[in-house]
């Protein structure tokens, strides 16, 4: 078990703060909830503290919760591939470029680390080149989320990882908006981190609303499990 992994044996409180600017539309989001890495479970609630969110909530899910991939459940035989927990408590910087097909792109930079006993994800997001009447600024996405696989590989030069995946957002007319994600994670501290073999995270997310909440908001339940690396030969012969 890495030193960082020991911090995730119970339920951990999570805070998320995002400052965004998409095509000049500035906004802020606060999120709170809890994570339980034993089950790869996240429960979070987000509110837009600046009024109405200028982009659809589903376009921010990867920035919020795929931001705290340290809560992914890594099976016993894969724990030596868990970069995310090994970087804690000092944490990691997570940078992404998200290309929305036939539309604009988000660039995000986040610092994910422990502040006391709380896991904090502080994010800056800049979005450019979006069509004012497109699927994103035109709010044409359905309020739901598909399951995805998130592919992880080591980046030895930067002592971190590179991550690629393609999100499929459902559009109200029945079509799909693709969002290509290019991600890089580097540790904040200078302690040792685990550099993984290639594998993936399997994610399932459910979006809902709080019937008593009048502010623009999103409630998120997510389960994330690491997969893609088989038991070694010695395991087979036990």
């Amino acid at each position: 078990m890495s030193k960082g992994e020991e911090l995730f044996t119970g339920v951990v409180p999570i805070l998320v703060e995002l400052d965004g600017d998409v095509n000049g539309h500035k906004f802020s989001v606060s999120g709170e909830g809890e994570g339980d890495a034993t089950y790869g479970k996240l429960t979070l609630k987000f509110i837009c503290t600046t009024g109405k969110l200028p982009v659809p909530w589903p376009t921010l899910v990867t920035t919020f919760s795929y931001g705290v991939q340290c809560f992914s459940r890594y099976p016993d035989h894969m724990k030596q591939h868990d970069f995310f927990k090994s970087a804690m408590p000092e944490g990691y910087v997570q940078e992404r470029t998200i290309f929305f097909k036939d539309d604009g792109n988000y660039k995000t930079r986040a610092e994910v680390k422990f502040e006391g006993d709380t896991l904090v994800n502080r994010i800056e997001l800049k979005g450019i080149d979006f069509k004012e009447d497109g699927n994103i600024l035109g709010h044409k996405l359905e309020y739901n989320y598909n399951s995805h696989n998130v592919y992880i590989m080591a980046d030895k030069q930067k002592n971190g990882i590179k991550v690629n995946f393609k999100i499929r957002h459902n559009i109200e007319d029945g079509s799909v908006q693709l969002a290509d994600h290019y991600q890089q994670n580097t540790p904040i501290g200078d302690g040792p981190v685990l550099l993984p073999d290639n594998h993936y995270l399997s994610t399932q997310s459910a979006l809902s609303k709080d019937p008593n909440e009048k502010r623009d908001h999103m409630v998120l339940l997510e389960f994330v499990t690491a997969a893609g690396i088989t038991h070694g030969m010695d395991e087979l012969y036990k």
């Epitope: 339920v11 805070l15 999120g31 709170e32 909830g33 709380t118």
Partner: nanobody
């Protein structure tokens, strides 16, 4: 998702006491900071008292110091507000609030989790 349910409100004479309860579900109670706000008709929702996570340190608004006491019982997933020496100006709807931050914000707009409220009326 965290759900909060208040109880214990009612009508009381000036100088009397009430004890409000806030039962939490849907989250891990021991890692929530909890508190109470109140809202009188035509006024903004204002902070009353808060109790932090496991260590239990407390904050109070100046206007209730020495009269109100906040406490929590982790085994029952419940927070309490003991209100003594009540005054007519304490009449309001009292809301339970929760946060995963170590300390609950004293600014209502920054609080994510709320109960539905319980009415407290203090007659003179």
């Amino acid at each position: 998702d965290v759900q909060l349910q208040e109880s214990g409100g009612g009508l009381v004479q000036a100088g009397g006491s009430l004890r409000l309860s806030c039962a939490a579900s849907g989250g891990t109670f021991s890692i929530l900071s909890l508190g109470w706000f109140r809202q009188a008709p035509g006024k903004e929702r204002e902070f009353v008292a808060a109790i932090s996570r496991s260590e239990g340190s407390t904050d109070y608004a100046d206007f209730v110091k020495g009269r109100f006491m906040i406490s929590r019982e982790n085994a029952k997933n419940t927070a309490y507000l003991q209100m003594n020496s009540l005054k007519p100006e304490d009449t309001a709807v009292y809301f339970c609030a929760a946060s995963y931050a170590r300390r609950l914000s004293t600014t209502a707009s920054r609080v994510l989790y709320w109960g539905q409220g319980t009415q407290v009326t203090v007659s003179s």
